[in-house]
Interface confidence: low
């Protein structure tokens, strides 16, 4: 806590300028009026204050706005944002995308800090949903942002926002997240033609059900192995050898290299060996000829 001391004669700050760099902590506390600071916040970011001096300026703003800073101040915080705690940020009401961008810019190139996570949370909650512009902004700064959300949070993403999602934004998403995002993507891209549709939907296919994969297999999409390996195992298992062959097209040869890995391994175990042999890839582990194939899922449903 900085002690309350009188401002020395002639040192009272008339404006926020470079002369304040030479003020000691107690002088800043005594000689800078908090209201003046609030109205000239845009200047603070352009003056090379030390981080210790910034602590004093923050303290002054905290005293002026105990209930939380107004957006006019927040937008111009600049590097002072790095001094804020999540508790400080929870008091804010940030509604402008420009304010969000200005503060994300300060943290650019760094991992998402607790401060940034809290800021984003406050912003999204204030908007009620993750609209396209917000998602565009967040994924531009943090490509992994979408996959940091819970399935419940993702449910508030409107299908129109899916257009802002790039393949790399989904790299770290797990199947539960893709389960939520896939139907939204399907809806968002539904009016596109076959090949264009596949290009857009490809990154989301980790959430696709069997019937959609069967439909895709009829469209000459030539899915690559990397995409196939990310499909839900339960969605791949019911596919026939012919359907997988059509789905992968020329990439079907890649199954051999992946035959020990899921979902290929589990799929092979469900296919007749005769059918697998038609691929000419030497895939082994299918059901030998003459054996009865029980559909266990149907059996469970009946019992």
């Amino acid at each position: 806590e900085v002690e309350k001391t009188a401002c020395p004669s002639g040192k009272k700050a008339r404006e926020i300028d470079e002369s304040l760099i030479f003020y000691k902590k107690w002088e800043l506390e005594a000689c800078v009026d908090a209201a003046l600071l609030a109205t000239q916040m845009d200047r603070v970011n352009a003056i090379p204050f030390t981080y210790e001096q910034l602590d004093v300026l923050k303290h002054k703003l905290d005293e002026l706005y105990p209930q939380g800073y107004p957006e006019s101040v927040i937008q111009h915080l600049g590097y002072l944002f790095l001094k804020m705690s999540p508790e400080d940020i929870r008091k804010w009401n940030v509604t402008s995308l420009e304010t969000l961008k200005a503060l994300l810019e300060v943290n650019k190139g760094h991992e998402m800090s607790p401060q940034v996570a809290t800021l984003i949370d406050r912003f999204v909650k204030g908007r009620g949903q993750l609209d396209k512009d917000t998602l565009d902004t967040l994924t531009a700064f943090y490509p992994g942002y979408l996959c940091s959300l819970s399935p419940e949070e993702l449910s508030s993403v409107p299908p129109s926002s899916i257009w802002a999602v790039r393949p790399q934004d989904l790299d770290t998403c797990d199947p539960r997240q893709l389960d939520v995002l896939y139907p939204k993507a399907r809806l968002a891209f539904q009016n596109m033609n076959g090949s264009e549709y596949f290009v857009k939907i490809q990154s989301f296919l980790g959430g696709a059900p069997t019937e959609d994969l069967k439909a895709l297999s009829q469209q000459n999409v030539s899915m690559d192995l990397a995409t196939f390996m990310k499909l839900r195992t339960d969605a791949v298992l019911p596919l026939t050898v012919a359907e997988v062959q059509k789905l992968l097209g020329p990439h079907v040869e890649g199954l051999k290299a992946e035959e020990r890995h899921r979902p290929v391994r589990d799929w092979i175990l469900r296919q007749r060996q005769d059918d697998l042999d038609t691929l000419g890839l030497g895939l082994q582990g299918g059901i030998p000829n003459g054996y009865l194939v029980l559909d266990l899922s149907m059996q469970e449903a009946l019992s």
Epitope: N45, A46, P48, T50, Y51, G78, Y79, V106
Partner: nanobody
Framework: EVQLVESGGGSVQAGGSLKISCAAS????????MGWYRHITEKERKLVAT???????YYADSVKGRFTISRDNAKYTVYLQMNSLKPEDTAMYYC??????????????WGQGTQVTVSS
Amino acid sequence: EVQLVESGGGSVQAGGSLKISCAASGSVIDIGAMGWYRHITEKERKLVATINAGGNTYYADSVKGRFTISRDNAKYTVYLQMNSLKPEDTAMYYCAAEDINYTGTEAYYWGQGTQVTVSS
């Protein structure tokens, strides 16, 4: 610890131009804002221009429109392009870099200075 080395100073006629630069080495990750100060006398130190990590600039009124500060974050170097020089710009120019881990009494790393002399 951060070391700052200035270069580019010299003598020039009024109305001429000079570009001075300052290269940082050592624990450069600890650098925040960087700026140029000038010492007219031993006791008077005046900020000329500064640029923070975000690229925001600030100029003393006396040099606005004539001097341009820039920064190359990849090379940890700050430059000061001085145009339309005046005799009153004559001074020793010092480079300063903020120590973001500052806890003690000195918040800045300082260079050794480079002399700029402008004759009429």
